[in-house]
Every structure is written in structure tokens, then in C-alpha cells.
Amino acid sequence: DTQEKEVRAMVGSDVELSCACPEGSRFDLNDVYVYWQTSESKTVVTYHIPQNSSLENVDSRYRNRALMSPAGMLRGDFSLRLFNVTPQDEQKFHCLVLSQSLGFQEVLSVEVTLHVAANFSVPVVSAPHSPSQDELTFTCTSINGYPRPNVYWINKTDNSLLDQALQNDTVFLNMRGLYDVVSVLRIARTPSVNIGCCIENVLLQQNLTVGSQTGNDIGERDKITENPVSTGEKNAATWS
């Protein structure tokens, strides 16, 4: 049976995808065939084939970035070390170990789902703009995060969420494979407006919040809070 595992990694970091037999196992590297490949597309990540030291069939995306330890393999540890994780690495990886002496049966099969994350930049809220006499427009921008974010606008007076129908979000996938987001909020003009923009990264359970206040005698001010959410509740009491 195939074991199933999940692991998280930050973009740019190194990660170990575990695939190992119980402690005390010993393997002859002339007997085992080891494959790390993606589950869906069967992209070759790395492998060990007896009497074949060449890794010419490794996909270019993983060349020099994915390694198994020969010493570890002797002990039954076929774990993969993946360097410099990218958003494109977010997929399921399959580790298969076959024994020639057992008729090329699988002696180990592990599927590891890799979840990739990157912190969004602290949001920047533009000064309010008045496209008309009775309307105010705010723009919130945050870049280089992963996975795709959720954007919320908050009434800072009572920490209530503003109606999402008032906002228009545009999410871009940038050159690095990370997400940039721009959210435009349109609200009715009032004498004093105290709002905040919150960028939520669900995978990291992290909210980044910036406030913007306007008023007759108060200039705009920004406030930055970074709140890792410990509960499963979305945006539960995380804005000050």
C-alpha cells in the first residue's frame, strides 16, 4: 500500500520529502531501483538504477536540485532533499522502491504532497481618491505571496468586515510564479473613514493588516499589524 504524507515549505527554502523503511533495514544498492517522480505527469525528479550512475533522465526543473543520500539508501532511507523550493514544486511526489531479488515488486511506496508558501509583502493602502463627490476609492496592494490570497476590507471602528461587493480584486501571477494582488475599495463618502486592508495567507495562517484613516482634522495614517491566526476561524479578532 502507498503511504501518504504532506509537507510544507517556504519558497526559496530547502525541504526533505520523507521516504524510508523502518529502522534497522539494510539495502543492497545493486538490488534496488528507486524512483522519485511526480504523481500526475510522471516528471522525473531523481532516481537510482543499479549500474547506471548517470542522471541524464532527470527533468531540467529538478537537475542539481533534488538529491538522495547514498549512505541513507543503504539504511533504507530514500528521502529526497529538494533545494530552493519554487511555487511550481507544489504537487504530489511519488517515491517508489523496487527490489530486483523480489521480482521488481515495490518494497516501499510513498506519496508526498508538497504545499508551498510565501509571505506577502506588507500591504500598501493608497491615499483615498475621490472619483466623484459622493464616493471614496482606496487601493490596497501586496506582492510576492503564495498561495493565492484572500483580501478583506475592515471597518476599523468596530472591526467589522466590509461587504465584499464593495471591492474589486485583481490577482496576478508574476514572473516568479508568486501572486501579486491589487484590491480597489469603493465606498460612500462620510465625514470620517477609518478602514483597513487585510491580506490573508490561509496556508501560513497569517494576516497582514494596514489601516488608513481620513477625517476633517486628521491626516491619513497607516498602521501595520501582522497576526498569525492560531484558530481556524477566518479573521477572528485579529485586527486592532
Partner: nanobody, 121 residues
């Protein structure tokens, strides 16, 4: 995509013989390494390897069939055969042909639809 077509299953009495054949629709390249084998599965049990033979000639037999079954292959015709002699009641199962391409990577598995072998007393 390689297709595997099995034949030769049927009903036989204990002590009798059957010959299973499996033909692959296309060959893997001459530089590739592969293994062809027969697995079987009886109701409520996991699929188990019965016998296999690699493109470089190494063979494997499950302990339960050693001395009774013989596996052979014809690389030119892309076929693998399993000669089953002295059949026992416990050999009753659906038998599946398998082609596993070992090299070049990735590891690829192809399966036949299965052929029923029933041994009666």
C-alpha cells in the same frame, strides 16, 4: 500507451494445467529495461506477484508456485507466457499481466484487464 491483452484463463481440475499468454501492443525501445509479470488477486485479498521475468532474463517465482509454474517471454513478439502445472484450489484467482518499464525513468506500469483461473476439485 501500451495495451496488454491476456488469454488462456479458464476452468480446470486440481492437478491440471493451463497456459496464460499476454501480448503487449507495442514494444518498449531496445535500450529500455523492463519486467513483465503475472499477478493474481482472489476475493478479499491483495494483488500478489506470481512470477516475473525481466528483459535481461532474471526470473522470480512466489514460493507458493515454485516448481509448478514456468514463466517465459519472447522479446521479439512482446509476449510473456505463464505455464501453470499441477494446479491447486488456492490458485483460483483473477490473473493480471503487468509490464513495468524500469529504465529509462520514469517508472511506468501497464496492466491487462485480467483473466479468470478457476481450479475445481
Amino acid at each position: 500507451e501500451v495495451q496488454l491483452v491476456e488469454s488462456g484463463g479458464g476452468l480446470v481440475q486440481t492437478g491440471g494445467s493451463l497456459r496464460l499468454s499476454c501480448a503487449a501492443s507495442s514494444s518498449t525501445s531496445t535500450s529500455s529495461i523492463d519486467v513483465m509479470g503475472w499477478y493474481r488477486q482472489s476475493p478479499g485479498k491483495q494483488r500478489e506477484l506470481v512470477a516475473s521475468i525481466s528483459s535481461f532474463g532474471s526470473t522470480y517465482y512466489a514460493d507458493s508456485v515454485k516448481g509448478r509454474f514456468i514463466i517465459s517471454r519472447d522479446n521479439a513478439k512482446n509476449t510473456v507466457n505463464l505455464q501453470m502445472n499441477n494446479l491447486k484450489l488456492e490458485d483460483t484467482a483473477v490473473h493480471f499481466c503487468n509490464l513495468r518499464r524500469l529504465s529509462p525513468p520514469p517508472l511506468l506500469d501497464y496492466w491487462g484487464q485480467g483473466t479468470q483461473v478457476t481450479v475445481s476439485s
